[in-house]
Amino acid sequence: FERTRSLQDPCSNCPAGTFCDNNRNQICSPCPPNSFSSAGGQRTCDICRQCKGVFRTRKECSSTSNAECDCTPGFHCLGAGCSMCEQDCKQGQELTKKGCKDCCFGTFNDQKRGICRPWTNCSLDGKSVLVNGTKERDVVCGPSPADLSPGASSVTPPAPAREPGHSPQ
């Protein structure tokens, strides 16, 4: 035969925001300050996440849900639920263990995060460089040299080989 959960376990009647207090005959007690329970029937409340230092509070903790953090300006979130904060860099830079470093020649980064990536090699597509690349911007490829007027030519040097995520220091 099958009994309902509430008959087997009086704690199942305790709603979110409370816990089943064994010290008080298993009555439902509210979660203490700075703690929460997001589901019913819990025997303990979980400690609220603290957003301090590199983290700042995006959503306050309540009796039924944990606090949510994001990062203090100058840093950005990494990981599920913003589990880490990572330093921003300027465009044209990438983050290394030595801090933000300029992209080396032939590479670019157009964001405040991520690594410097090699400029597009236009010649691989049979095209020419229309606009040169910079540390912040990729090259712009134009028509193929054959499409240019007679006598005109454009030579695209190959992008330097580079291990992703590392700049020469």
Epitope: G53, V54, L78, M84, C85, K97, G165
Partner: nanobody, 123 residues
Framework: EVQLVESGGGLVQPGGSLRLSCAAS?????NYWMNWVRQAPGKGLEW???????????YYVDSVKGRFTISRDNAKNSLYLQMNSLRAEDTAVYYC????????????????SGQGTTVTVSS
């Protein structure tokens, strides 16, 4: 509970010195890269320095090179920042922060930091 607690801040005159400390608890300090970051009034957060697990690698933001020294004592579960030749622009709240798992390999994320200690440089 994993915790970092900073101390040692205060009011100091330009050219003076301070030594900040950070006491770590709830984890093994020697397993992690550690960092100091700071936030000046009305500004964003700025990375200051970091140090690897055994103290053999130390890096600094350009503005503090030659003036600040980061160090650690793993036996005492403590991180330090010796600040010399202090300038008005060093005025900030200073936080110690732990590099997350994989720091320096596939990210430079910080996963734990303290409440901060305030450094004011003024005459």
């Amino acid at each position: 509970e994993v915790q970092l607690v900073e101390s040692g801040g205060g009011l100091v005159q330009p050219g003076g010195s301070l030594r900040l400390s950070c006491a770590a608890s709830g984890f093994t300090l020697s397993n992690y890269w550690m960092n100091w970051v700071r936030q000046a009034p009305g500004k964003g957060l700025e990375w200051v320095a970091n140090i690897n697990q055994d103290g053999s690698e130390r890096y600094y933001v350009d503005s503090v090179k030659g003036r600040f020294t980061i160090s650690r004592d793993n036996a005492k579960n403590s991180l330090y920042l010796q600040m010399n030749s202090l300038r008005a622009e060093d005025t900030a709240v200073y936080y110690c922060a732990r590099g997350g798992e994989g720091y320096g390999v596939d990210h430079y994320g910080l996963d734990v930091s303290g409440q901060g200690t305030t450094v004011t440089v003024s005459s």
